[in-house]
């Protein structure tokens, strides 16, 4: 057979769908690999193949279209499941091609069991709601295609087992779960089950996305350094070790780059030639709001290092800030020299 | 046994002010209720005037009611409603229910409180 | 804004008979809806929410069906006891404005014969 040009297993697609419900898979080809959609590539006289590799297997094969109830179909460039069985994992390949061009990429699907509860091993995605915010919802994701406009399916939300019902503070509106005013104590994961008939048949479709409650905007301050502050002095002799932690707590910014950094007389701790280490740990609260500690240490500080200026520096969407530490060298103790003057005296 | 009690209502002439008093008693505000005031005028419908969410002090309006209707909470128990600008129109009982906004199986009224705006 | 429409109004009914109660929403508020009973001098009865669930106590006479705009409640074997007006409520929200709106029907009288 003539060259293909292969883009190999798009494992960055990793497809994960829910056994006995149908899917459908659009071909990697044209969204992430070809520069023309699939209409353009038909029209000009390319053709689609599928085919697949069973799990476990080695071996490339057909798919079989010909199953009762047309259970697998393909319809231009979606590959469809009517439904989806377990043995149905491995991984699917897409092929354009004629008698002059030819591109592939394969792809790997897994169908996935689910409980009662909806617990399954499916990534989920990750909803952020602002703590306190006014009206905010989330959506049924990943249902479009699968039903005309012209059916009405009916959707149930869950709360983890529970059907959102008696939720003072969300409303179940269609496709839609709005939040009235999103609390800690929503922070779970949410099921949308959209049930929908076809040719005298009913599906479902389950889609589950965890909600995080996080900080609001309308909360947000630049960031706080805690440490360094004015209360307290590091007062060191030299030869003694130096550490100072920078302690910044930021505000939740939805994309925000939170930076913490040292500066010593005006440089970053690499430009200089001093041995001096910086370890970080972060730690987030329950809204995400995070607390960044750098602690800079210096084994054997010397008495040049003690006069030299420390600053902490830190940056967030909300704006920049610094605070120097206060740093110097310990002065020793005066030694007393006791002189003791005995005078023995007679009465 | 839990139970909502509405107190302040009175006589007041047009243009004046009243506030009324939601009391709680079998439980308290410090759990996530919406606490609403719902009227009724004399012969007529119910309308909504406002709800508080009692664990944020979050508030919802009708568009009529926004600026001259006041929902606020007091204490653990007590939710207040204060009136401005009153006119004829706005005699009426006046009721505080509780999970009204979404409503739930956890809905309660209270037996209302007369307002009459009469010079 | 949200409007409930409450047909319709008067409504008779002999003892044993059933009665239908119809609201409709000016837009879909799927199954947002509440039902009412309220006697004179007293507050309103909470009787089914979210369109089609009893609340507790509630006899099994009275259902509500209906989602999206249009809605019903049933009657089934009326009681003398059932006279009094009835009342939908309806909840949506509109999330380009941060708001909400909780809407009462009109009410329908239901007069036992």
């Known amino acids: 057979s003539e060259r293909c040009d292969d883009w190999g297993l798009d494992t960055m697609r990793q497809i994960q769908v829910f056994e006995d419900e149908p899917a459908r898979i659009k071909c990697p080809l044209f969204e992430h690999f070809l520069k023309f959609n699939y209409s353009t590539a038909h029209s000009a006289g390319l053709t689609l193949i599928w085919y697949w590799t069973r799990q476990d297997r080695d071996l490339e094969e057909p798919i079989n279209f010909r199953l009762p109830e047309n259970r697998i179909s393909k319809e231009k460039d979606v590959l469809w499941f009517r439904p989806t069985l377990l043995n149905d994992t491995g991984n699917y390949t897409c092929m354009l091609r004629n008698t002059t061009y030819c591109s592939k990429v394969a792809f790997p699907l897994e169908v996935v069991q689910k409980d009662s509860c909806f617990n399954s091993p499916m990534k989920l995605p990750v909803h952020k709601l602002y703590i306190e915010y006014g009206i905010q919802r989330i959506t049924c994701p990943n249902v479009d295609g699968y039903f005309p406009s012209s059916v009405k399916p009916t959707i149930t939300w869950y709360m983890g087992c529970y059907k959102i019902q008696n939720f003072n503070n969300v409303i179940p509106e269609g496709m839609n779960l709005s939040f009235l005013i999103a609390l800690i104590s929503n922070n779970g994961n949410y099921t949308c089950v959209v049930t929908y008939p076809e040719n005298g048949r009913t599906f479902h479709l389950t889609r589950t996305l965890t909600v995080k409650v996080v900080g609001s905007p309308k909360n947000a301050v630049p960031p706080v350094i805690h440490s360094p502050n004015d209360h307290v002095v590091y007062e060191k002799e030299p030869g003694e070790e130096l550490l100072i932690p920078c302690t910044v707590y930021f505000s939740f910014l939805m994309d925000s780059r939170n930076e913490v950094w040292w500066t010593i007389d005006g440089k970053k701790p690499d430009d200089i030639t001093i041995d001096v280490t910086i370890n970080e740990s972060i730690s987030h609260s329950r809204t995400e709001d995070e607390t960044r500690t750098q602690i800079l240490s210096i084994k054997k500080v010397t008495s040049e290092d003690l006069k030299r200026s420390y600053v902490c520096h830190a940056r967030s969407a909300k704006g920049e800030v610094a605070k120097a530490a206060k740093v110097k060298q310990k002065v020793p103790a005066p030694r007393y020299t006791v002189e003791l003057a005995c005078g023995f005296g007679a009465t | 046994q839990e139970q909502l009690v509405e107190s302040g209502g009175d006589l007041v002439k047009p243009e004046g002010s009243l506030t009324l008093t939601c009391t709680a008693s079998?439980?308290?505000?410090?759990?996530?209720?919406?606490i609403c005031w719902v009227r009724q005028a004399p012969g007529k419908g119910l309308e909504w005037i406002a709800c508080?969410?009692?664990?944020?002090?979050?508030t919802y309006y009708p568009n009529w009611a926004k600026g001259r209707f006041t929902i606020s909470k007091t204490s653990s128990t007590t939710v207040t409603l204060q009136m401005t600008s009153l006119t004829a129109a706005d005699t009426a009982t006046y009721f505080c229910?509780?999970?009204?906004?979404?409503?739930?199986?956890?809905?309660?009224w209270g037996q209302g409180t007369l307002v009459t705006v009469s010079s | 804004a949200l409007v409930m429409t409450q047909t319709p109004s008067p409504v008779s009914a002999a003892v044993g008979g059933t009665v239908t109660i119809n609201c409709q929403a000016s837009?879909?508020?799927?199954?947002?809806l509440a039902w009412f009973q309220q006697k004179p001098g007293q507050p309103p009865k909470l009787l089914i929410y979210?369109?089609?669930t009893l609340a507790s106590g509630v006899p099994s006479r009275f259902s509500g069906s209906g989602s999206g705009t249009e809605f019903t409640l049933t009657i089934s074997g009326v009681q003398s006891d059932d006279a009094a007006t009835y009342y939908c409520?309806?909840?949506?929200?509109?999330?380009?404005?941060?708001?909400?709106?909780?809407?009462f029907g009109g009410g329908t009288e239901v007069v036992v014969k």
């Open positions: 229910a509780r999970d009204l906004l979404v409503v739930t199986s956890f809905n309660l």
């Open positions: 079998g439980f308290s505000f410090s759990s996530n209720y919406w």
């Open positions: 508080i969410y009692t664990s944020t002090d979050t």
């Open positions: 837009e879909d508020i799927y199954s947002n």
């Open positions: 979210g369109a089609s």
């Open positions: 409520l309806g909840v949506c929200t509109d999330i380009s404005a941060d708001d909400l709106y909780n809407t």
